[in-house]
């Protein structure tokens, strides 16, 4: 129901995971710190969906428009395997966000503009999308100077067997990065140069 959560002034954590939620609830309490919307049927994130959530620290949108290829559980993708649509300005208000999970959203691209106000982000999960090409450049990483943990796992292209792994040059700008996960990147050999961007 509209405004259902607005009266909950002291609500800090809201989990609506594994439901049939079709859109981000309107008028969420502004003091919310954590919002879990994973495994729902949201198809589009609108410009103002998170507008008042200036204190939000954790946002999990995983499993909306999931990547269903080869998964060992029941899975329904969005029509034509289309990605979760995210407005360019949807994350503008999330200046305090520390954790963003976009696991299995069928994303093909990650626009830098999503992160222009997200300077405090420490953990980004982009696993199980269609980001094999994006990972080779990943310009958006320039916008995330404080990232500590990054997950690119299981973004392999279907029926493609890469000769080697190509990590983006932009990774070298992540001075605080401690954990990089790239499981399920299908390639033949690890070259001497493959991990050069991680050398400090």
């Amino acid at each position: 129901e509209k405004d259902a959560f607005l009266v909950m002034r002291n609500l800090k954590v809201l989990s609506l995971k594994d439901n049939n939620v079709t859109a981000v609830p309107t008028t969420l309490p502004p003091n919310l710190l954590e919002l879990y919307l994973y495994n729902n049927i949201i198809k589009k994130i609108q410009e103002n969906d998170f507008n008042n959530l200036n204190e939000l620290q954790v946002l999990d949108l995983s499993g909306n428009c999931p990547r269903c290829y080869n998964v060992p559980y029941p899975c329904t993708p969005c029509e034509n395997n289309s990605p979760l649509q995210i407005h360019d300005n949807a994350f503008n208000s999330l200046t305090e966000l520390k954790v963003l999970r976009l696991h299995s959203n069928s994303l093909q691209h990650v626009p830098p503009t999503w992160f222009k106000n997200m300077r405090n982000l420490q953990e980004l999960d982009l696993s199980q999308n269609y980001l094999a090409r994006e990972i080779e450049e990943a310009k958006f990483l320039h916008f995330l100077p404080n990232l500590v943990e990054l997950d690119f796992s299981f973004n392999y292209e279907l029926q493609v067997y890469h000769a080697s792994i190509t990590l983006p040059h932009s990774l070298s700008s992540l001075e605080n990065l401690k954990i990089l996960r790239v499981k399920g990147y299908v390639f033949k050999e690890l070259k001497n140069s493959s991990l050069s961007v991680l050398h400090k």
Epitope: E47, Q85, H109, P111, P112, T113, H142, F143, P145, S173
Partner: antibody, heavy 125, light 107 residues
Framework: EVKLVESGGGLVQPGGSLRLSCTTS????????MEWVRQPPGKRLEWIAA??????????EYSASVKGRFIVSRDTSQNILYLQMNALRAEDTAIYYC????????????????WGAGTTVTVSS | DIVMTQSHKFMSTSVGDRVSITCKAS??????VAWYQQKPGQSPKLLIY???TRHTGVPDRFTGSGSGTDYTLTISSVQAEDLALYYC?????????FGGGTKLEIK
């Protein structure tokens, strides 16, 4: 060939209004962010307004210097971008350029790969 | 707003010379810098974005470099047709902002 052609500039008195047009061709207009950038005489380029693409609901964004006075809009059937300028001031005197955002798979880049030739607006009594 | 400063308003060079035009941002813009060329009586033309990526059709004598707050556009061998104004622009945050321009003059 991608083309942007501005029109509608001219001399206007302070407090007056003017509507600029930018006629576009050679690309899918609704797929791109479109911008207005101006250049006052002898000064630096200044971004003033954006009309987002269809994927981003054709919403708009403005610089602080024109917010509340200027309105950017588009006619997607004719592929025309507009800039309605109200409450004009002497400091609005400039060449006004229409520019296309370079685009990153349907998202903005905030750098501009195609520019029109510009149209001159003079605000003076 | 992020302020972009081009300290040299004018630079004089000769055909065949190497020239570097500099630009400083008021804060770290994480390589999100574009360069434009504006010839007399013309509109700006995109040369470089993301500090070092050459736009389609731009001659390879134009190269961009830099990080943090300091950025450079280098023309390795200046040609007569390079006489123009050169602007830097940050595309790190909105509003996008431009430098004041550097006018390249040919001796």
């Amino acid at each position: 060939e991608v083309k942007l052609v501005e029109s509608g500039g001219g001399l206007v008195q302070p407090g007056g209004s003017l509507r600029l047009s930018c006629t576009t061709s050679g690309f899918t207009f609704s797929d791109f962010y479109m911008e207005w950038v101006r250049q006052p005489p002898g000064k630096r380029l200044e971004w003033i307004a954006a009309s987002r693409n269809k994927r981003n609901d054709h919403t708009t964004e403005y610089s602080a210097s024109v917010k509340g006075r200027f309105i950017v809009s588009r006619d997607t059937s004719q592929n025309i971008l507009y800039l309605q300028m109200n409450a004009l001031r002497a400091e609005d005197t400039a060449i006004y350029y229409c520019a296309r955002d370079a685009d990153y798979y349907g998202s903005s880049t905030w750098y501009f790969d195609v520019w029109g030739a510009g149209t001159t607006v003079t605000v003076s009594s | 707003d992020i302020v972009m400063t081009q300290s040299h308003k004018f630079m004089s060079t000769s055909v065949g010379d190497r020239v570097s035009i500099t630009c400083k941002a008021s804060q770290d813009v994480r390589t999100a810098v574009a360069w434009y060329q504006q010839k007399p009586g013309q509109s700006p033309k995109l040369l470089i974005y993301w500090a070092s990526t050459r736009h389609t059709g731009v001659p390879d004598r134009f190269t961009g470099s830099g990080s943090g707050t300091d950025y450079t556009l280098t023309i390795s061998s200046v040609q007569a047709e390079d006489l123009a104004l050169y602007y830097c622009q940050q595309h790190y945050n909105t509003p996008p902002t431009f430098g004041g321009g550097t006018k390249l003059e040919i001796k």
